[in-house]
């Protein structure tokens, strides 16, 4: 029906007020709902009005705004502090205390989190996103800095349907349609060997409790398990010779263990240093990525910390130690 | 196969010392925690130790601080109990237990060994 | 130090009943609490971790449930191999420690 310059939708009806002509719903069933597109964000319940723009949000806190898109700090939280002496005491001993696992801890001081103190130092949403690993999608967490709310944005519930099939013939040189999908790691970019490399900028370094024969050996599954939590492909650098960058790597006792053998004499052979694992150095190639998702790293900082992060969820299913993310080509060290 | 091996239980005089130690096989040693936890005849469990090989790091209850030390050589794949200044009531069933969750002494302890028996008594 | 209380201490079921162990915790530990069984002369064995997952190999009739400071370990339907001993367990924090357990008898 005709409102003057309002043109009201199907169901609705032309009302004359003090402050000019309204439209109006007599009957919600028969008008278009304002709820069929979901307004209302961040968990807030949408109820069905008579009046534009139809629907009204009820916010969980600390949302509100008309369709709690605005967020709004408690007014009198202090800022969480890690007042225990026992995280004191235990951080950055290499173990990780879930008691002292919270972002007021550091993560234990990086005990839990791969070395790294402070995964979201780059996310500047208003929300504490490392408290929003909810299996919910938080829009103001679903940002690269913020490491994609950890893919809760888009449909993150996805297996990999013939998961067994698909891990054993995974970068096989192969390509097998059924495991080429985001979900399935893209078979390894197996179908896409035609296709152009896609580098992010960097290299991810990467400590693993694994002796480099074993970590070599086992080098598709690895790949695999990191890549599905990146939600991108993932490989081993070749140095200039063309040899895979994966060494040795001997170690770092905690300081507690230093100075214990500080003071006592070595004993006969404990000079001769131990191979505690291997130190790989992995490159994103996101060809497949960016043809499927909007949400691929351009560079290796946010992988790094998106790591750390699943580290601090405990979610990582190989025993890495840390986790750098290397602007630069790196010199060989140790 | 994960396996775990204890050995070196006995009979000790009050005051006196034994090390135990737990043989491990079937994994990658130093990646994983390793707890010592006894159980005195007839009692429940207690938890006395815990050691993350890779880092060194050891954790002790009360009851046995600063007369206990628990160590761990990864190029023999073994870790061990130092018990000095022994007591009546540390008589029990010593087991060593793997940690489930590599670097978090805050996951369960998922392969026990079989036990080794520690009586203290004059 | 967190404090695990178990009850009952000890029960008498037949085969075929469903059984419900409870252990209380003096301070939260959020889901960090796991169960296990001993039986006589033999080291114990996980059944459940993180309050409700299965250790590989235990059967679907033991279940866990619970979070904070209450938890349950539940037999659905008793068979003959599960009478033993049941520890609950926190690994919130150190020192980790046990609940005094549970004896599962025969009626």
């Known amino acids: 029906s005709s409102c003057g310059q309002v043109k009201c939708r199907k169901g609705e009806q032309c009302v004359h007020t003090a402050s000019g002509p309204r439209c109006f719903c007599p009957s919600p069933r028969d008008c278009e709902s304002g709820c069929a597109s979901s307004p209302c964000q961040h968990g807030g319940s949408c109820h069905p009005q008579r009046q534009p723009p139809y629907y009204s949000c009820q916010c969980a806190p600390p949302f509100s705004g008309s369709r709690c898109e605005l967020y709004t700090a408690p007014p009198s939280t202090p800022p969480a502090t890690c007042l225990s002496q026992y995280c004191a005491d235990k951080a950055r001993d290499g173990v990780c205390d879930e008691a002292c696992n919270s972002h007021a801890c550091q993560w234990d001081g990086g005990d839990c989190s791969l070395t790294m103190e402070n995964p979201w130092a780059n996310c500047s949403s208003p929300l504490p996103c490392w408290d929003y690993i909810n299996n919910q999608c938080d829009e103001l967490c679903n940002t690269v800095e913020c490491l994609f709310d950890n893919f809760e944005c888009q449909g993150n519930s996805k297996t990999c349907k013939y998961d067994k099939y698909c891990a054993d013939h995974f970068k096989d040189n192969h390509c097998d349609q059924g495991c080429n999908s985001e979900e399935c790691g893209w078979d390894g970019l197996d179908c896409a060997a035609d296709q152009p490399e896609n580098l992010a900028e960097g290299t991810l370094v990467i400590v693993v409790l694994m002796p480099p024969e074993q970590l070599l050996q086992d080098a598709r599954s690895f790949l695999r398990a990191l890549g599905t939590l990146l939600h991108t492909n993932l490989r081993i650098k070749r140095d200039s010779q063309g040899e895979l960058m994966v060494y040795p790597y001997y170690g770092e006792k905690s300081a507690a263990m230093k100075k214990q053998r500080m003071t006592r004499r070595s004993l006969p052979g404990e000079q001769e240093q131990e191979v505690a694992g291997s130190k790989v150095f992995l490159e994103i190639d996101n060809r497949q990525c960016v043809q499927d998702s909007d949400h691929c790293f351009k560079n290796t900082d946010a992988a790094a910390a998106l790591l750390a992060s699943h580290a601090i969820q405990g979610t990582l299913s190989y025993p890495l130690v840390s986790v750098v993310s290397e602007s630069l080509t790196p010199e060989r060290t140790q | 196969e994960v396996q775990l091996v204890e050995s070196g239980g006995g009979l000790v005089q009050p005051g006196g010392s034994l090390r135990l130690s737990c043989a491990a096989s079937?994994?990658?040693?130093?990646?994983?925690?390793m707890s010592w936890v006894r159980q005195a005849p007839g009692k429940g469990l207690e938890w006395v130790s815990y050691?993350?090989?890779?880092?060194?790091?050891?954790y002790y209850a009360d009851s046995v601080k600063g007369r206990f030390t628990i160590s761990a050589d990864t190029s023999k794949n073994t870790a061990y109990l130092q018990m000095n200044s022994l007591r009546a009531e540390d008589t029990a069933v010593y087991y060593c237990?793997?940690?489930?969750?590599?670097?978090?002494?805050?996951?369960?302890?998922?392969?026990w060994g079989q036990g080794t028996l520690v009586t203290v008594s004059s | 130090d967190i404090q695990m209380t178990q009850s009952p201490s000890s029960l008498s079921a037949s085969v075929g009943d469903r059984v419900t162990i409870t252990c209380r915790a003096s301070?939260?530990?959020?889901?960090?609490l796991a169960w296990y069984q001993q039986k006589p002369g033999k080291a114990p064995k996980l059944l459940i971790y993180?309050?409700?997952s299965r250790a590989s190999g235990v059967p679907s009739r033991f279940s866990g449930s619970g979070s904070g400071t209450d938890f349950t370990l539940t037999i659905s339907s008793l068979q003959p191999e599960d009478f033993a001993t049941y520890y609950c367990?926190?690994?919130?924090?150190?020192?980790?420690?046990f609940g005094q357990g549970t004896k599962v008898e025969i009626k």
């Open positions: 237990a793997r940690h489930s969750g590599y670097y978090r002494i805050s996951s369960a302890m998922d392969v």
């Open positions: 079937g994994y990658t040693f130093s990646s994983y925690g």
């Open positions: 050691i993350y090989p890779y880092s060194g790091a050891t």
């Open positions: 301070q939260s530990n959020r889901r960090f």
């Open positions: 993180g309050a409700s």
């Open positions: 367990q926190q690994y919130y924090i150190s020192p980790l420690t």
